[in-house]
């Protein structure tokens, strides 16, 4: 079903350039390039350049799209859960009863049984069953750090609710730390948010597994619904493959620009507005690295006799199990531009203009 | 350059199903389906089902991929900036000098001049130039709410640094609120994080535009580098188009399953593991809505005579200005499965298995 053709790289580039001509005008909702008859002589006003640079700073600080997923993310993750240490454990006695906090401890040997190596952990969530809540409550999650010190992790604004609801906190980094360290018991603290002004905040929210008095050792645990860690990890027996030569490459500028990859990859393309598009109306920048995606993504017949060899190719060539996989942009970045409308200079941000990496999809 | 063929829908489905067969085995790193000789009789253990359900809950709560961008995100955003009201303004006198906070006020008439309608605002960032910092500092950002009350917005852990650095806080929602309300001056407060235990926290970080004493009215403003709001918005004159009939549809299950769209769209495909793949080894679920993407994404020649009509098509058919646009998945969701390895039931999460929407890329 695949008809092989020799790729005319120059034609592809020409088509990409022409598409960009339309794309930019379309994003600006212009039917044609704006007239330059009102543009005053000389450089852009300082304030406009400062604004353009602020926008460029923003772009430099963050990609519009998430980074390409690491290879490990393609493979299945085994899911396990580790329940909170029951509250009659002596560890809870070390933490004074408080109106603003509850404590949750976990046995790291159970965690290590589920995830033998920190690198195998893909995601860890702390799950708490929140019972009904009468008022809005701002809560903070802390991790036990050393002896009696606590490190802030995250916060959540809980809306009032008549029905129980599971809360989930991403604690992947913390659990990865715990797996690397030698401790036997590690824990979290859920506290009311206290600002520097008002410090008499009480934790109003009831978490299943703790009495309202909040003394852990008096708690009634409702079945399996006490706090737990939901873990997603690559099984140990599957992990060795990740280091093998067949791992999935990021088809990004770092790899593709320095390789002779024939298959799907990001290809270099610099657009000079004046030379390539015949445009002088964009004052800044003078051009940009648009790049483009090109190269085959072979469809893999999974009924092939060399089954195990074939399966290893899925990750790279057809991870989405498409009927006709296609080489398309993965990570994209925006482009700020400065141009004049009449006498007025405008700074505009065009989304998804720069191709940083590609993928078979 | 495009060779039109009649699409054999059944062949496409068959190829998608076969690709899924390989994909699942590949994700599990299995060369063939696991033997079922050791599977005990009866239903799955309750703990395994609870774990499977926890994983499904997670899936329900969040998509693996971000939601498709709204149509407005395709179009260029005008960038403007509004500087903080100078600190000799009387508004600063109303807020007592404090060691744990600094205050930043903005003139809403300036905001409204930049963004006449709240709906036009795409993004707002509060930018602060942080001067060198000797110690790690945990800071919180608050918005002025009513009279003297403050609403928590976000927090940041600032690492020690010898050089100045811009900090950026996403305050889109807040600025949108301000644009909707009648107030003249609105503000933010940057405070040290105070936990309920230790309350003697001082704001150690110096923000350009405030003296170390932190009394706004004594502040020396260094040029344009005092705190400002960076705004990205759809210009008013461009906004009317967004309501027009030519707007970009989300090519998701809601639209595609109920339309006769010939172009790129998500197509319905339910995979029954037993009937379609001849598999009985996956205990849960019995099947899933895999779906797939299909339909042309015409390349648009921007040099076409009907220029303004052509440009309106970019958004839908070739938003990424590709030389050969392709119909590919946009939003994907994971699939948790339960299967046995020997006598042991396993819950595994397979990433990017369910196609929720498509796009031309």
């Amino acid at each position: 079903l695949s008809t092989c053709k020799t790729i005319d790289m120059e034609l592809v580039k020409r088509k990409r350039i022409e598409a960009i001509r339309g794309q930019i005008l379309s994003k600006l909702r212009l039917a044609s390039p704006p007239s330059q008859g009102e543009v005053p002589p000389g450089p852009l006003p300082e304030a406009v350049l400062a604004l353009y640079n602020s926008t460029r700073d923003r772009v430099a600080g963050e990609s519009a799209e998430p980074e390409p997923e690491p290879e490990a993310d393609y493979y299945a993750k085994e899911v396990t859960r580790v329940l909170m240490v029951e509250t009659h454990n002596e560890i809870y006695d070390k933490f004074k009863q408080s109106t603003h906090s509850i404590y949750m401890f976990f046995n790291t040997s159970e965690l290590r049984e589920a995830v033998p190596e920190p690198v195998l952990l893909s995601r860890a969530e702390l799950r708490l069953l929140r019972l009904k809540l009468k008022v809005e409550q701002h809560v903070e999650l802390y991790q036990k750090y050393s002896n009696n010190s606590w490190r802030y992790l995250s916060n959540r604004l809980l809306a009032p609710s008549d029905s129980p609801e599971w809360l989930s906190f991403d604690v992947t980094g913390v659990v990865r730390q715990w797996l690397s360290r030698g401790g036997e018991i590690e824990g979290f603290r859920l506290s009311a948010h206290c600002s520097c002004d008002s410090r008499d905040n009480t934790l109003q929210v009831d978490i299943n597994g703790f009495t309202t008095g909040r003394r852990g050792d008096l708690a009634t645990i409702h079945g399996m619904n006490r706090p737990f860690l939901l873990l997603m990890a690559t099984p140990l027996e599957r992990a060795q493959h990740l280091q093998s030569s067949r791992h999935r490459r990021a088809l990004d500028t770092n790899y593709c620009f320095s390789s002779t990859e024939k298959n799907c990859c990001v290809r270099q393309l610099y657009i000079d507005f004046r030379k390539d598009l015949g445009w002088k109306w964009i004052h800044e920048p003078k051009g940009y690295h648009a790049n483009f995606c090109l190269g085959p993504c072979p469809y893999i017949w999974s009924l092939d006799t060399q089954y195990s060899k074939v399966l290893a190719l899925y990750n790279q060539h057809n991870p989405g199990a498409s009927a006709a996989p296609c080489c398309v942009p993965q990570a994209l970045e925006p482009l700020p531009i400065v141009y004049y409308v009449g006498r007025k200079p405008k700074v505009e941000q065009l989304s998804n203009m720069i191709v940083r990496s590609c993928k078979c999809s | 350059l495009s060779t039109c063929k009649t699409i054999d829908m059944e062949l496409v489905k068959r190829k998608r199903i076969e690709a899924i067969r390989g994909q699942i085995l590949s994700k599990l790193r299995l060369a063939s389906p696991p033997s079922q000789g050791e599977v005990p009789p009866g239903p799955l253990p309750e703990a395994v089902l609870a774990l499977y359900n926890s994983t499904r809950d997670r899936v329900a709560g969040e998509s693996a991929e971000p939601e498709p961008e709204p149509e407005a995100d395709y179009y260029a955003k005008e960038v403007t900036r509004v500087l903080m009201v100078e600190t000799h303004n009387e508004i600063y006198d109303k807020f007592k000098q404090s060691t744990h906070s600094i205050y930043m006020f903005f003139n809403t008439s300036e905001l409204r001049e930049a963004v006449p309608e709240p709906v036009l605002l795409s993004r707002a960032e509060l930018r602060l130039l942080r001067l060198k910092l000797k110690v790690e500092q945990h800071v919180e950002l608050y918005q002025k709410y009513s009279n003297n009350s403050w609403r928590y917005l976000s927090n940041r852990l600032l690492a020690p640094s010898d050089s100045p650095e811009w900090l950026s806080f996403d305050v889109t929602g807040v600025v949108r609120q301000w644009l909707s309300r009648g107030g003249e001056i609105e503000g933010f407060r940057l405070s040290a994080h105070c936990s309920c235990d230790s309350r003697d926290n001082t704001l150690q970080v110096d923000i350009n535009g405030f003296t170390t004493g932190r009394r706004g009215d004594l502040a020396t403003i260094h040029g344009m580098n005092r705190p400002f709001l960076l705004l990205m918005a759809t210009p008013l004159e461009r906004a009317q188009h967004l309501q027009s009939s030519r707007h970009r549809r989300a090519l998701d299950t809601n639209y595609c399953f109920s339309s006769t769209e010939k172009n790129c769209c998500v197509r319905q495909l339910y995979i029954d593991f037993r009937k379609d793949l001849g598999w009985k080894w996956i205990h849960e679920p019995k099947g899933y809505h895999a779906n797939f993407c299909l339909g042309p994404c015409p390349y648009i020649w921007s040099l076409d005579t009907q220029y303004s009509k052509v440009l309106a098509l970019y958004n839908q058919h070739n938003p990424g200005a590709s030389a050969a646009p392709c119909c590919v998945p946009q939003a994907l969701e994971p699939l948790p499965i339960v299967y046995y390895v020997g006598r042991k039931p396993k819950v595994e999460q397979l990433s990017n298995m369910i196609v929720r929407s498509c796009k031309c890329s």
Epitope: S35, Q36, G37, E38, V39, P40, P41, G42, P43, L44, K280, W281, H283, G342, R343 | -
Partner: antibody, heavy 121, light 107 residues
Framework: EVQLLESGGGLVQPGGSLRLSCAAS????????MSWVRQAPGKGLEWVSA????????YYADSVKGRFTISRDNSKNTLYLQMNSLRAEDTAVYYC??????????????WGRGTLVTVSS | DIQMTQSPSSLSASVGDRVTITCRAS??????LNWYQQKPGKAPKLLIY???ELESGVPSRFSGSGSGTDFTLTISSLQPEDFATYYC?????????FGGGTKLEIK
């Protein structure tokens, strides 16, 4: 054909007035800023005045400010220079030039052949 | 006002020579500098804009360079038709100003 054609030059006494015209053809006149540049006999080029595409903005050299007025009629594709209080030092060939103002570079990419203005008693 | 000083004011060269003309501004103008060629009895003709951009239709032996206040027009291999007067012009701010010109003559 893209071209500019000046007219209206001639001999005038000091203190007198003259109106120069420049007829444009072959391009979208209103999309361009336009300018007048002069060259005294045996001397170099001197910029005189410029006007934006809509006529909303005008610019003058200090030596002519208050005496000369630049204007345009986009419906007639014509540029004008009204010269009052003429002085002997205004004697020059006056060139009409199209301004490419893209990027703020303001260069003269199309020139007329010029019209000679002589101020003498 | 920004003063533009060209040097030399005149120079003699032969066909095939490499010739360099310089232009100095009294203040920073980069890259708002344009170059023109004028032959006797004719209107000037644009060669280079934005300090280094070659106007379409101009032979590639002409090139412009420089930044800040100092700029150069180079003719890599003089042709008979290149003997003319050359002017630089700044468009950094109004009033727009020209250099005094450089007359290029046959040796």
């Amino acid at each position: 054909e893209v071209q500019l054609l000046e007219s209206g030059g001639g001999l005038v006494q000091p203190g007198g007035s003259l109106r120069l015209s420049c007829a444009a053809s072959g391009f979208t006149f209103s999309s361009y800023a336009m300018s007048w540049v002069r060259q005294a006999p045996g001397k170099g080029l001197e910029w005189v005045s410029a006007i934006s595409g809509s006529g909303g903005s005008t610019y003058y050299a200090d030596s002519v400010k208050g005496r000369f007025t630049i204007s345009r009629d986009n419906s007639k594709n014509t540029l004008y220079l009204q010269m009052n209080s003429l002085r002997a030092e205004d004697t020059a060939v006056y060139y009409c030039a199209r301004v490419d103002s893209s990027g703020g570079y303001w260069y003269f990419d199309l020139w007329g052949r010029g019209t000679l203005v002589t101020v003498s008693s | 006002d920004i003063q533009m000083t060209q040097s030399p004011s005149s120079l003699s060269a032969s066909v095939g020579d490499r010739v360099t003309i310089t232009c100095r501004a009294s203040q920073f103008i980069s890259p708002y500098l344009n170059w023109y060629q004028q032959k006797p009895g004719k209107a000037p003709k644009l060669l280079i804009y934005a300090a280094s951009e070659l106007e379409s239709g101009v032979p590639s032996r002409f090139s412009g360079s420089g930044s800040g206040t100092d700029f150069t027009l180079t003719i890599s291999s003089l042709q008979p038709e290149d003997f003319a007067t050359y002017y630089c012009q700044q468009s950094y701010s109004t009033p727009l100003t020209f250099g005094g010109g450089t007359k290029l003559e046959i040796k």
